[in-house]
Amino acid sequence: GLQDPCSNCPAGTFCDNNRNQICSPCPPNSFSSAGGQRTCDICRQCKGVFRTRKECSSTSNAECDCTPGFHCLGAGCSMCEQDCKQGQELTKKGCKDCCFGTFNDQKRGICRPWTNCSLDGKSVLVNGTKERDVVCGPSPADLSPGASSVTPPAPAREPGHSPQDIEGR
């Protein structure tokens, strides 16, 4: 069968029906990320509370993050939400402190329960706070006479970063 002439059009171009199916470059502020496209997509614009993390090119869309004081929510940073402090979570009534027994080590997201050391047969080496998880120590068996010395494990997770902890500081 006949090959579709449009299949020869590479990314960054579109198959222009108005010009005898010639491969035309995508117009400014548009892109095509795959070959054989009959139209180019409009570039995303990072405006308002969004800022440009990656510029649009003829072959890839722009990527946004959030301006200072805000962080991304949703796939592809579809929304920006105000930062809270570590030790808090955002509710409908604003940022609220984590309840006792929970923590949040980021400026975004929800408060999570402290690790239950006893479930792993371990003891609490360092108490938890609103901002930090507990640190579990060696199990009682490890502390029995003759047991080899044990280095306390590091916290289960490292403090996370919101987009603007990394950028623009």
């Epitope: 614009q45 990072c46 405006k47 308002g48 509370v49 800022r51 440009t52 301006t67 200072p68 004081g69 805000f70 105000q82 930062d83 809270c84 402090k85 808090q88 955002l90 009534k93 604003g94 940022c95 400026k107 950028e167 623009g168 500081r169």
Partner: antibody, heavy 118, light 107 residues
Framework: QVQLQESGPGLVKPSETLSITCTVS????????VHWVRQPPGKGLEWLGV???????DYNPSLKSRVTISKDTSKNQVSFKLSSLTAADTAIYYC????????????WGQGTLVTVSS | DIQMTQSPSSLSASVGDRVTVTCRAS??????VAWYQQKPGKAPKALIY???YRDSGVPSRFSGSGSGTDFTLTISSVQPEDLATYYC?????????FGGGTKLEIK
């Protein structure tokens, strides 16, 4: 309607600490951030810092070691403190609200003139 | 820090004139630029954010444009009440920085 009102001491001596209060109405500090900006007489604007709705703060590095911003949400007040004052800190000090749409200032207080002099 | 350089520092215009103020950022700030108007003896007032969006209640004769490093504030038909100093501000990264201001006088 949205209003912000600064109240300051007017005259402060060098090396002392400046303390200004911004009282807000028409919006909640639970939902909005508040910036502090100053303007020396006859000069331009300088951003000093911001306190966000959750209470986290960001400061201008040029002043960071001298500035403290805090708030009392129940009183609708934001507090600004600047330590180790010199004559160069003489300025009009403004508080301004940050909207939910960008990191900018949509409503401003009328400003309070602070003179640093012995 | 990102420097915001405004020009001209002052200009004089007649009522009905079209006036343009420019602002250049020392590095790419996308469209994260706001413009403020400060009338003599008053606090600044927000005019435009995101380079081109008018704040609520701002007359349509004020418009903004630009992206990257070059930005423009245009007053299509100057009115007597536009006597003021105009400032640009970038909010792409900390610290937030302002331009030096453009003082508009009315002939």
């Amino acid at each position: 309607q949205v209003q912000l009102q600064e109240s300051g001491p007017g005259l402060v001596k060098p090396s002392e600490t400046l303390s200004i209060t911004c009282t807000v109405s028409g919006f909640s500090l639970i939902s909005y951030g508040v910036h502090w900006v100053r303007q020396p007489p006859g000069k331009g604007l300088e951003w000093l810092g911001v306190i966000w709705s959750g209470g986290s703060t960001d400061y201008n590095p040029s002043l960071k070691s001298r500035v403290t911003i805090s708030k009392d949400t129940s009183k609708n007040q934001v507090s600004f403190k600047l330590s180790s004052l010199t004559a160069a800190d003489t300025a009009i000090y403004y508080c301004a609200r940050n909207p939910l749409t960008a990191t900018v200032m949509d409503y401003w207080g009328q400003g309070t003139l602070v003179t640093v002099s012995s | 820090d990102i420097q915001m350089t405004q020009s001209p520092s002052s200009l004089s215009a007649s009522v009905g004139d079209r006036v343009t103020v420019t602002c250049r950022a020392s590095q790419n700030v996308g469209t994260n630029v706001a413009w403020y108007q400060q009338k003599p003896g008053k606090a600044p007032k927000a005019l435009i954010y995101s380079a081109s969006y008018r704040d609520s209640g701002v007359p349509s004769r004020f418009s903004g444009s630009g992206s990257g490093t070059d930005f423009t504030l245009t007053i299509s038909s100057v009115q007597p009440e536009d006597l003021a100093t105009y400032y640009c501000q970038q909010y792409n990264s900390y610290p937030l920085t302002f331009g030096g201001g453009t003082k508009l006088e009315i002939k």
